[in-house]
C-alpha cells in the first residue's frame, strides 16, 4: 500500500434510519444466520479525513491499548506504530502488554515511495465497535517508517484485509481476518460503506463526523438501497475482479476488455483514486474531456495535480459525465454495471482557495499495476467482501453524494460474452521482483 495517494474520508450524508430494513430481493439466496440484518453496534464505526484514510478503533494488548487503524483492503498485514514518531499521537507499547508474544522475526515493506519496517509478534486484538470477540492476531510492530504515517490523519496503524498470498514477509503470516474467522464464530465476510461528504472537512469536523461503516461478519440493509449485485473474486490475493466494459456517459470506450484488467483489477479501500491502466486512462480522459468540452481545464488538472475551483455552490456537475464499469456477473455471460458520478471522481480539497470557493482535484489517475477501484468507486457503493463465497457485492450506498438529477447506480443483468477472456494472466515472477505499492 502506498500512502502517497490516500482516500478521501468525509462525513456521511443521511442514509436510511437504523430501524428500517428493506425487503429482500426475490433473487437473493435465503438468509443465513449472522450474515444479514442489523449490526447497529458496527454502523458508523469509521472516521477519517479527506484524502488520508478511513480508520476504525481497535484495541491491542492487555490491558487494552486503543489505536485508530486504517482499513485497507489492498494489503494483508496488521501493522501498528510501535515507537515514537512525529506524526503519531500514540503508539503500541509492547512492553506494557502482558499478552504480547515476540515472533523473533523482522518484516520490511517497501512502497513505490516510502516504506515501513518492524518486528513481528502476536497479541490480543479486539474491535470495540465490532463483533464482541477478542482474537490473538499477528501484529507487525512498526519501529521505523518513511512516508507512511500521515501528519494529522489520526490513525496509527493499518489493517490489511486482503488474503495471505500478499502478506509480508510471506504468505505464512496469517492475516487478521483469517485469524478472526478461525478463532470465533464470525462469518467469513465483511462489508464497507465509505461515505464521502462531497465537501472538505477540517480537523474538528472530522473528529465529530461519521466516515462510514465496517460491518464485520455480515450485511446491514440500512446501508444500501436496491439490490446487491455480486462479481466473482478472480483470485484470492488482492480482492481481484474482472471489468468487462467501460462507458463514459453511456459511450463504450470500445477497448479490448483485457486492457481494463491489465495486469489486474482490484477493490482497494486504501487508495483514494480510481486508477486505470495507461491506455485506459488516456481513453477515459479523452472521453471525459469531450463530454465536458464546454469548459476547458489545464493538463495539470487531468493529471490530478492542479485544483479547479468554482464559486461556492456553483460546481457544474452536469457538464461532467457519469462513468460506468461493467463487472463480470455470477452467471455465465451475465454482467452488471456500477455507475459513479462526478461527485465521486472530483475530490473536494480543503484550505486552498477562499471560503467562497469549492475546489476539487480530479481523482482518476494512471496506473502501471492495473485498475484500482479505490475510494472514488467505493464511496458510491456499499461493498460486500463475501470471502466465504469468493465474491464481492455492490449496491448503491445510502450515504453517497449525488444531486437532484443523477444518482450512482448498480444495474443489471447485461449479456456479455467471453468474459473470461477479459482477465489478464500475470506471468509467474520471482516474488522478490514484485513492486509493492500504489503510486
Amino acid at each position: 500500500t502506498q500512502h502517497g495517494i490516500r482516500l478521501p474520508l468525509r462525513s456521511g450524508l443521511g442514509g436510511a434510519p437504523l430501524g428500517l430494513r428493506l425487503p429482500r430481493e426475490t433473487d437473493e439466496e435465503p438468509e443465513e444466520p449472522g450474515r444479514r440484518g442489523s449490526f447497529v453496534e458496527m454502523v458508523d464505526n469509521l472516521r477519517g479525513k479527506s484524502g488520508q484514510g478511513y480508520y476504525v478503533e481497535m484495541t491491542v494488548g492487555s490491558p487494552p491499548q486503543t489505536l485508530n487503524i486504517l482499513v485497507d483492503t489492498g494489503s494483508s498485514n496488521f501493522a501498528v506504530g510501535a515507537a515514537p514518531h512525529p506524526f503519531l499521537h500514540r503508539y503500541y507499547q509492547r512492553q506494557l502488554s502482558s499478552t504480547y508474544r515476540d515472533l523473533r522475526k523482522g518484516v520490511y515493506v517497501p512502497y513505490t515511495q516510502g516504506k515501513w519496517e518492524g518486528e513481528l509478534g502476536t497479541d490480543l486484538v479486539s474491535i470495540p465497535h465490532g463483533p464482541n470477540v477478542t482474537v490473538r492476531a499477528n501484529i507487525a510492530a512498526i519501529t521505523e517508517s518513511d512516508k507512511f504515517f500521515i501528519n494529522g490523519s489520526n490513525w496509527e496503524g493499518i489493517l490489511g484485509l486482503a488474503y495471505a498470498e500478499i502478506a509480508r514477509p510471506d504468505d505464512s503470516l496469517e492475516p487478521f481476518f483469517d485469524s478472526l474467522v478461525k478463532q470465533t464464530h464470525v462469518p467469513n465476510l465483511f462489508s464497507l460503506q465509505l461515505c464521502g461528504a462531497g465537501f472538505p472537512l477540517n480537523q474538528s469536523e472530522v473528529l465529530a463526523s461519521v466516515g462510514g461503516s465496517m460491518i464485520i461478519g455480515g450485511i446491514d440493509h440500512s446501508l444500501y438501497t436496491g439490490s446487491l449485485w455480486y462479481t466473482p473474486i478472480r483470485r484470492e490475493w488482492y480482492y481481484e475482479v474482472i471489468i468487462v466494459r467501460v462507458e463514459i456517459n453511456g459511450q463504450d470506450l470500445k477497448m479490448d476488455c483485457k486492457e481494463y484488467n491489465y495486469d489486474k483489477s482490484i477493490v482497494d479501500s486504501g487508495t483514494t483514486n480510481l486508477r486505470l491502466p495507461k491506455k485506459v486512462f488516456e481513453a477515459a480522459v479523452k472521453s471525459i474531456k469531450a463530454a465536458s468540452s464546454t469548459e476547458k481545464f489545464p493538463d495539470g488538472f487531468w493529471l490530478g495535480e492542479q485544483l479547479v475551483c468554482w464559486q461556492a455552490g456553483t460546481t457544474p456537475w452536469n457538464i461532467f459525465p457519469v462513468i460506468s464499469l461493467y463487472l463480470m456477473g455470477e452467471v455465465t455471460n451475465q454482467s452488471f454495471r456500477i455507475t459513479i458520478l462526478p461527485q465521486q471522481y472530483l475530490r473536494p480539497v480543503e484550505d486552498v482557495a477562499t471560503s467562497q470557493d469549492d475546489c476539487y482535484k480530479f481523482a482518476i489517475s494512471q496506473s502501471s499495476t492495473g485498475t484500482v477501484m479505490g475510494a472514488v468507486i467505493m464511496e458510491g457503493f456499499y461493498v460486500v467482501f463475501d470471502r466465504a463465497r469468493k465474491r464481492i457485492g455492490f449496491a448503491v450506498s445510502a450515504c453517497h453524494v449525488h444531486d437532484e438529477f443523477r444518482t450512482a447506480a448498480v444495474e443489471g443483468p447485461f449479456v456479455t460474452l467471453d468474459m473470461e477472456d477479459c482477465g489478464y494472466n500475470i506471468p509467474q515472477t520471482d516474488e522478490s521482483t514484485l513492486m509493492t505499492g500504489r503510486a
Epitope: E295, K296, P298, G300, D351, V352
Partner: antibody
Framework: QLQLQESGPGLVKPSETLSLTCTVS??????????WGWIRQPPGKGLEWIGN???????YYNPSLKSRVTISVDTSKNQFSLKLSSVTAADTAVYYC????????????WGRGTLVTVSS | EIVLTQSPATLSLSPGERATLSCRAS??????LAWFQQKPGQAPRLLIY???NRATGIPARFSGSGSGTDFTLTISSLEPEDFAVYYC??????????FGGGTKVEIK
C-alpha cells in the same frame, strides 16, 4: 502575430458601470487552446485577476468581484468584454486583457492596458 | 487562500550583477508558478512558466527554480533593460488568480 487591444471610456462616474472591450487581431478568439482574461492594476499597486472566459461562453470570476463582474464573448467580432457595475474610486486602475495560454495556465500575451478613472 | 510573498520588496543592484528574487507560497503550489516582468507604462510580460521554463523569446540570463513553497527567479547578469518590477503568480489553484506583491529591481 496575435495582438490584443483594450478599448472603452477612460472616465466613469461612481455607481455607474465600467465597460471595456478587448479586440483580438491576428488570430481567432474561437481557438480551443486559450481562455481570455481581464487583469487590473491600481496606480502604483500590484496585479489583480478579474476573470476569464472561454469562447463557448464559460466564465470564471474573482470571488471578491463576482457580484459586480460580467465577462462576455462575441466570436463574430473576435472580441470579449468586461462589465463592472457599481464602481467606486477603488476601481480606478489600468485594465489589461490577456490570453491564458500554455495549457490554459499562464497569461502569455497581454494588451497594452487602458487606464480607467472612477470620478465624478 | 494561497498567499504569495515576494522578497525583497526592492533590490538595488548595478548592471552586470546577479539578481536573486524570492517568491514564497503559504502552501505548496507544486511547480505551478510563473514569473512576470513589468516595466513602467507597459503591460506585464511572461518570463518563466511552470517554475523553470523560459517563455518564448526570453533571454537565457533569466532562470527560475524551486517547487512546493519556495521559488527563485535569477537574473545571472543584469542588463539595463532588466530594471523593472517582477511578479510571481501561482496557478496550482485554477483559474489563475493569485499574484505576489512584486519585487522592484532598481539601479544602485
Amino acid at each position: 502575430q496575435l495582438q490584443l487591444q483594450e478599448s472603452g471610456p477612460g472616465l466613469v462616474k461612481p455607481s455607474e458601470t465600467l465597460s471595456l472591450t478587448c479586440t483580438v487581431s491576428g488570430g481567432s478568439i474561437s481557438s480551443s487552446s486559450y481562455y481570455w482574461g481581464w487583469i487590473r492594476q491600481p496606480p502604483g499597486k500590484g496585479l489583480e485577476w478579474i476573470g476569464n472566459i472561454y469562447y463557448s461562453g464559460s466564465t470564471y470570476y474573482n470571488p471578491s468581484l463576482k457580484s459586480r463582474v460580467t465577462i462576455s464573448v462575441d466570436t463574430s467580432k473576435n472580441q470579449f468584454s468586461l462589465k463592472l457595475s457599481s464602481v467606486t474610486a477603488a476601481d480606478t486602475a489600468v485594465y489589461y486583457c490577456a490570453r491564458l495560454g500554455h495549457g490554459y495556465n499562464y497569461f502569455d500575451l497581454w494588451g497594452r492596458g487602458t487606464l480607467v478613472t472612477v470620478s465624478s | 487562500e494561497i498567499v504569495l510573498t515576494q522578497s525583497p520588496a526592492t533590490l538595488s543592484l548595478s548592471p552586470g550583477e546577479r539578481a536573486t528574487l524570492s517568491c514564497r507560497a503559504s502552501q505548496s503550489v507544486s511547480s505551478y508558478l510563473a514569473w512576470f516582468q513589468q516595466k513602467p507604462g507597459q503591460a506585464p510580460r511572461l518570463l518563466i512558466y511552470d517554475a523553470s521554463n523560459r517563455a518564448t523569446g526570453i533571454p537565457a540570463r533569466f532562470s527560475g527554480s524551486g517547487s512546493g513553497t519556495d521559488f527563485t527567479l535569477t537574473i545571472s547578469s543584469l542588463e539595463p533593460e532588466d530594471f523593472a518590477v517582477y511578479y510571481c503568480q501561482q496557478v496550482y489553484v485554477w483559474p489563475p488568480r493569485t499574484f505576489g506583491g512584486g519585487t522592484k529591481v532598481e539601479i544602485k
